[in-house]
């Protein structure tokens, strides 16, 4: 299937130009999406092009400026948050990034009723996290690892926790590993639906080993960055969950929520918290060996002012073939009865589907089924359930939005998006207003992205929110590569691939091939999305064929493929990339003497192992910020897929699956190894060990480090990185500069 056909016609060929590396580095062909900031069933806020915060009322069709760009600029605000009672807005400035999600900032409170900033009892700075209550204008914030509460923005704060300490005790915010590998948020506190209670997590990192690395900066002596970071098998953070009554916070203070006995018997994680009502909360826990998850529904006991989690309200989810869940264990979406819920987990055939749990998991009613997967539940209303899946036309790399009518029997299913803009749009997400009165659809491709607004009752399109007209016009004279998404059937395994072909692709010619790989567990690279990026340039200007292959371990095609890599990372992911390359060679248009592979992070690990596979298939390759040994990576992620690095568990495969163990095999390939020295995630240690092993084996290789750069290699480093990699590949493929 040609998803993005080139618009080249002979008559206009001379007016068309290829993509340049400069185009990519400048973001010339980047696209915009429009996610409404919903504030009610029919209203949303959006930052206009001139930086005013504007309220849109869908029903009246009218717009209102609620915060002027001057007010924003007066404190250099880069973000805002409206209190639910619409009396105040917080303005966020002095953004200072920490890890993937976390950052600190300065917050100012603006009073919308008098058009002035709140003076008196101002917030301290910098704040680690701040949020409004879901009703009214209470504020909860985290400062210096402690949680504070304000009943009104101008009130003095009430301090909820006192034991917070940098790198030791974290209250209301996650430590490094929980942020990156479990919660995927910068916060660890949750308001109850009407703001009566505030739940929060306390993470004790006192006994966690610390990763230390130099940050060179500009000073005479480098700084040392210290992060409590549990690597595989190391001591983990100890987590506790507390709930405090925010109306009378001093009355009984924070009350701890009990951990289910079957979880508490050994090392465990807290995985998420979902409020059901003001007096009912749902916590999810996970054993350290991550194949058992427990969902626990707890109720407030007024008489004792405590939280009770009866065993009858514990729901166990267990995997016998892999780990629990996909990348994370899914979270429940509760129905209006406040006890039953909808949840995605594996069905008996090993496909992730929506189930309805009323009493026990064993008696769950399966809502969706088939040899495809339900991916996300967006919203459950009284009569509808909205979810996304990759069911349509059996393409795993697509996402369509479906509505199931749960108010009628039997429930009927409707694909909301499948036929809207079929050629342009095959990969959607959605954003719903209160009670799903309206929703926005954001289409990511394969055509130019478009965001639209829809009526939640009829699904009728109301208006286009963003259609990227400027981008469409800018691309009119660009020779874009062609893209195809197809599949290979190999030994009962389906390998989906995306191939990016030069604009004047001719099957009778031979082209250099670059494999771009990620390949991590529960990832997906072959997606029907729009992108004009580095590999688009390599195809358009440099005439390369680029391929992305989803092998074993990747997501949304069933547990057989997903869990195939369980306890043996670094084997099948590599095998499947190699198998695909052989199939591509058989297609007849690949120059088998000019094949390269590159990847970043997990992809750097896979590309390194592929280069060191001894197949002779690859002439060269690049690893950016690779993992080199699973003993060096975070416990939560690594142990999910690999178990523990102990003799009686999986130490042998931990040792066998390192890049260093294959140092000798790099002798016959050109290898470019790249890493940021301040990588908090995949530590520079990984590349340092590869380099040491290669030196010890007397194997020549190329390397580039980026001083003080993290796992993202952002800013000017990005330009340098892609320029450097381009030169390396062109040299490898004997392409003239």
């Amino acid at each position: 299937i040609v998803l993005r056909p080139s618009r080249v016609h002979n008559s206009e060929e001379n007016t068309m130009r290829a993509l340049t590396l400069k185009d990519i580095l400048n973001g010339t062909f980047s696209y915009k999406t429009f996610f409404p900031n919903w504030i009610s069933g029919q209203e949303y806020l959006h930052q206009s092009a001139d930086n005013n915060i504007v309220l849109y009322n869908i029903e009246t069709g009218q717009s209102y400026t609620i915060l002027s760009n001057r007010t924003m600029k007066s404190v250099n605000a880069s973000n805002y948050g409206l209190s639910p009672d619409r009396q105040f807005v917080y303005l966020e400035s002095d953004y200072s990034k920490l890890w993937r999600y976390s950052y600190t900032a300065t917050y100012y409170i603006y009073d919308l009723s008098n058009g002035e900033f709140v003076r008196g009892n101002e917030l301290p700075r910098p704040i680690q996290y701040l949020c409004w209550s879901p009703v009214g204008s209470k504020l909860a914030y985290v400062y210096q690892n402690n949680i504070y509460l304000k009943q009104r923005p101008g009130d003095p704060p009430f301090q909820i926790t006192f034991n917070g300490r940098e790198n030791k005790i974290f209250n209301g915010i996650p430590d490094w590993v929980y942020e990156e590998e479990m919660l995927a948020t910068k916060y660890a506190l949750w308001w109850s639906p009407n703001g009566k209670f505030l739940a929060y997590a306390e993470f004790n990192d006192t006994d966690i080993p610390v990763i230390a690395y130099s940050y060179y900066g500009d000073e005479q002596y480098p700084r040392t960055i210290n992060i409590p970071y549990p690597k595989a098998g190391a001591k983990n953070p100890v987590v506790r969950i507390f709930i405090i009554d925010t109306t009378y916070p001093a009355y009984v203070g924070p009350q701890e929520v009990p951990v289910p006995a079957m979880i508490a018997s050994s090392d465990y994680y807290f995985s998420w918290l979902t409020w059901v009502t003001d007096e009912r909360v749902c916590l999810q826990w996970l054993k350290r060996v991550q194949n058992v998850s427990v969902l626990s529904i707890c109720d407030f006991r007024e008489d004792w002012q405590t939280w009770d989690c009866p065993k009858t309200q514990e729901h166990i989810e267990e995997s016998r073939t892999g780990w629990a869940g996909g990348f994370f264990v899914s979270t429940p979406v509760f129905s209006y009865d406040a006890i039953s819920y909808y949840k995605i987990f594996s069905d008996k055939d090993g496909y992730k589907h929506i189930h309805y749990i009323k009493d026990t998991v064993e008696n769950a009613i399966q809502i969706t089924s088939g040899k495809w997967e339900a991916i996300n539940i967006f919203r459950v209303t009284q009569d509808s359930l909205f979810y996304s899946s990759n069911e349509f036309e059996e393409y795993p790399g697509r996402r369509n939005i479906y509505r199931i009518s749960i108010g009628s029997y039997p429930p009927s299913k409707k694909c909301v998006t499948c036929h809207l803009r079929k050629e342009r749009c095959q990969y959607y997400t959605a954003s719903f207003s209160d009670y799903a009165k309206y929703y926005a659809l954001v289409c990511y491709g394969p055509g130019i992205p478009i965001s639209t607004l829809h009526d939640g009752r009829t699904d009728q399109e109301i208006k286009i929110l963003e259609e990227n007209k400027e981008l469409e016009n800018a691309l009119k004279n660009i020779q874009l590569p062609k893209e195809e998404i197809k599949k290979l059937e190999v030994d009962e395994i389906t390998l989906w691939y995306k191939m990016i072909l030069p604009p004047q692709f001719d099957r009778s010619k031979k082209y250099p091939l670059l494999i771009q790989v990620y390949g991590g567990p529960c990832s997906q690279s072959v997606r029907s999305v729009f992108a004009v990026n580095w590999i688009s340039y390599l195809a358009s200007k440099e005439g390369m064929v680029i391929a992305l292959v989803d092998g074993r371990g990747t997501a949304f095609q069933g547990d057989k493929l997903l869990y195939a890599v369980y306890r043996k990372l670094g084997v099948y992911e590599v095998e499947d990339q190699i198998t695909a390359v052989r199939k591509f060679i058989e297609m007849g248009f690949i120059d088998e003497k000019r094949i390269a592979i590159w990847g970043w992070s997990y992809g750097g690990y896979v590309s390194s192992l592929a280069l060191a596979s001894g197949t002779g298939l690859f002439k060269c390759g690049i690893a950016v910020a690779p993992v080199s040994s699973w003993e060096y990576y975070a416990s939560v992620y690594t142990e999910r897929f690999m178990g523990l690095p102990t003799k009686d568990d999986n130490l042998e495969h931990y040792k066998n699956s390192t890049v260093m163990a294959r140092a000798e095999y790099f002798r016959n390939v050109d290898y470019l190894l790249i890493h940021g020295t301040a990588d908090d995630n995949v530590h520079f240690q990984n590349s340092a060990q590869i380099a040491k092993a290669l030196v010890n084996a007397q194997v020549d290789f190329q390397a580039m480090w980026y001083s003080d750069q993290n796992h993202g290699l952002s800013g000017l480093s990005t330009n340098h990185l892609y320029t450097h990699m381009t030169h390396f590949l062109k040299q490898c493929f004997s392409l003239s500069d």
């Epitope: 029919q42 029903e59 069709g61 717009s63 209102y64 400026t65 002027s68 009672d85 919308l112």
Partner: antibody
Framework: EVQLLESGGGLVQPGGSLRLSCAAS????????MDWVRQAPGKGLEWVGD????????IYNQKFKGRFTISIDKSKNTAYLQMNSLRAEDTAVYYC????????????WGQGTTVTVSS | DIQMTQSPSSLSASVGDRVTITCRAS??????????INWFQQKPGQPPKLLIY???NRGSGVPSRFSGSGSGTDFTLTISSLQPEDFAMYFC?????????FGGGTKVEIK
């Protein structure tokens, strides 16, 4: 200090037209919507319509749609109410009001200008 | 259109009295937890003045003796201790749905 000053009222014959002006001062015109409200002698208040100054987007009371038009001149910091095909029942004091969108509230009102439709 | 019915249409009270004016909407004016009901005070020959917005929030410079409450269809304006300057006409208004509509008014007179 926020001030709204209406002008342009007067006596007009049935079927005639009139353009009312509302000069705004003491705040930035584009930061708030402008609404018009009328009050017939001895009667209650009646909302006419609303304009979003940044784009000129308007909404109207259906009762006046087609006859009344709200517009704005940002350079003059002035909003207008163009009234056509006037009838005797359009006789009223016409107020322009500053509309605070986040609260859907008319927080400042002009003193009003009187329109009399009579032959 | 949403009809707003105010009661009483007039009332006589003395300084220091607690006064309550009610306003009933012909349909719910709740908007996902908020009610866009506003109250205005109008004195003869003057434009209306915003007293209460969003059911219960006092306008700028409005004394604390004025308060508002209610939800759904029934709303109340309360003057806890009537002052001489409070003798005026009071209007409720809904801005939850276009066209925005006003109540017929309540005249508060000196007893």
């Amino acid at each position: 200090e926020v001030q709204l000053l209406e002008s342009g009222g007067g006596l007009v014959q049935p079927g005639g037209s009139l353009r009312l002006s509302c000069a705004a001062s003491g705040y930035t015109l584009t930061d708030y919507n402008m609404d018009w409200v009328r009050q017939a002698p001895g009667k209650g208040l009646e909302w006419v319509g609303d304009i979003y100054p940044n784009t000129g987007g308007t909404i109207y009371n259906q009762k006046f749609k087609g006859r009344f038009t709200i517009s704005i001149d940002k350079s003059k910091n002035t909003a207008y109410l163009q009234m056509n095909s006037l009838r005797a029942e359009d006789t009223a004091v016409y107020y322009c009001t500053r509309f605070r969108g986040i609260h859907y509230a008319m927080d400042y009102w002009g003193q009003g200008t009187t329109v009399t439709v009579s032959s | 259109d949403i009809q707003m019915t105010q009661s009483p249409s007039s009332l006589s009270a003395s300084v220091g009295d607690r006064v309550t004016i009610t306003c009933r909407a012909s349909e719910s004016v709740d908007n996902y937890g908020l009610s866009f009901i506003n109250w205005f005070q109008q004195k003869p020959g003057q434009p209306p003045k915003l007293l209460i917005y969003g059911t219960s929030n006092r306008g700028s410079g409005v004394p604390s003796r004025f308060s508002g409450s209610g939800s759904g269809t029934d709303f109340t304006l309360t003057i806890s201790s009537l002052q001489p300057e409070d003798f005026a006409m009071y209007f409720c208004q809904q801005s939850n749905e276009v066209p925005y509509t006003f109540g017929g008014g309540t005249k508060v007179e000196i007893k």
